[in-house]
Amino acid sequence: AFGISGVQKYTRALHDSSITGISPITEYLASLSTYNDQSITFALEDESYEIYVEDLKKDEKKDKVLLSYYESQHPSNESGDGVDGKMLMVTLSPTKDFWLHANNKEHSVELHKCEKPLPDQAFFVLHNMHSNCVSFECKTDPGVFIGVKDNHLALIKVDSSENLCTENILFKLSET
């Protein structure tokens, strides 16, 4: 809709940004699917949750994720101590007390059980993309987005703004 933002080129990380409020500005329960309409599902296996990207059978119920929205200051790329406007960040929780986390060392997306306040790895800048899609950029690693790799969620480095329309980092949010 609003067009696609370019990749955050700053060496200053988004984790220098500050979440304006401790409590979310709003919450939204939605199913998450890929650009190609595959569903993101969550399964409890051996006391931990696994995340899958798969085609659902007809009439199979989609898993829901609670998106909590936070307003955040966007750090300036100038002196480093300025503020360059506002942005929206989200946390994603498919079940009580579990949140999606960015594991930047392993380039993976994992479900971790944790208490509030949540760690920075649980926060993602929400981008309003073309074609009614969104993307999720790691707060802790600018230019790195949640994406799809080998039927799993992974962290994908987007090295230029032209590549932000790559289908594997585009997601759809739906109430159904």
């Epitope: 933002s5 939204y28 981008h127 309003n128």
Partner: antibody, heavy 119, light 111 residues
Framework: EVQLVESGGGLVQPGGSLRLSCAAS????????MSWVRQAPGKGLEWVAT????????DYVDSVKGRFTISRDNSKNTLYLQMNSLRAEDTAVYYC????????????WGQGTLVTVSS | EIVLTQSPATLSLSPGERATLSCRAS??????????LNWFQQKPGQPPRLLIF???NRGSGIPARFSGSGSGTDFTLTISSLEPEDFAVYFC?????????FGQGTKVEIK
């Protein structure tokens, strides 16, 4: 400091052409979606066109489709609006605007440049 | 396209008074659980300035006397106590879908 400075406005005859420019500074230009919004004298605001940071996508209001072209040169930190087949109703102050990081709203505005279409 | 209707067209008030401005959308501006309705202030000879985004969140450097509320199709901008510099024209705008549209504006003038 984030700044947007428009130029290229002026008086043009109906049917004529004009190219507006917007020089951006104080931020990583390619990281942001950019737009043009216009305001006829004494009137309200009208969104004209938007271009994504990576130049991949453009959108236009119906009244300018086929006549106006939005473009950008990320190496020069400059946004453009090529206006052809100009009409009297295109007379307005044209503002260059930058979206916020993530593209949810118009956050930064230039001072505007006046385009007058008249014979 | 989504049509935004602002009321009243003009609001005549004195400094220190409370201003309540309304914006009604022809259809819901909700998307992804957000109300994508923004408010701008414009003074003569100046560009618009972002006041409120996503219905209720203040832009950078905006004083706390400005607040936004509403959801779906009905939205309100409130200025709790008017300062002399607040007398201006206020526009609402939706960023849910193209074409992005603005209301016709409400002028807040000194009584």
């Amino acid at each position: 400091e984030v700044q947007l400075v428009e130029s290229g406005g002026g008086l043009v005859q109906p049917g004529g052409s004009l190219r507006l420019s917007c020089a951006a500074s104080g931020f990583t230009f390619s990281s942001f979606s950019m737009s043009w919004v216009r305001q006829a004298p004494g009137k309200g605001l009208e969104w004209v066109a938007t271009i994504s940071g990576g130049k991949t996508f453009t959108d236009y209001v119906d009244s300018v489709k086929g006549r106006f072209t939005i473009s950008r040169d990320n190496s020069k930190n400059t946004l453009y609006l090529q206006m052809n087949s100009l009409r009297a109703e295109d007379t307005a102050v044209y503002y260059c605007t930058r979206a916020n990081y993530g593209n949810w709203f118009f956050e930064v505005w230039g001072q505007g440049t006046l385009v007058t279409v008249s014979s | 396209e989504i049509v935004l209707t602002q009321s009243p067209a003009t609001l005549s008030l004195s400094p220190g008074e409370r201003a309540t401005l309304s914006c009604r959308a022809s259809e819901s501006v909700a998307k992804y659980g957000l109300s994508l309705l923004n408010w701008f202030q414009q003074k003569p000879g100046q560009p618009p300035r972002l006041l409120i985004f996503a219905a209720s969140n203040r832009g950078s450097g905006i004083p706390a006397r400005f607040s936004g509320s509403g959801s779906g199709t009905d939205f309100t901008l409130t200025i709790s106590s008017l300062e002399p510099e607040d007398f201006a024209v206020y526009f609402c705008q939706q960023s849910k879908e193209v074409p992005f549209t603005f209301g016709q504006g409400t002028k807040v003038e000194i009584k």
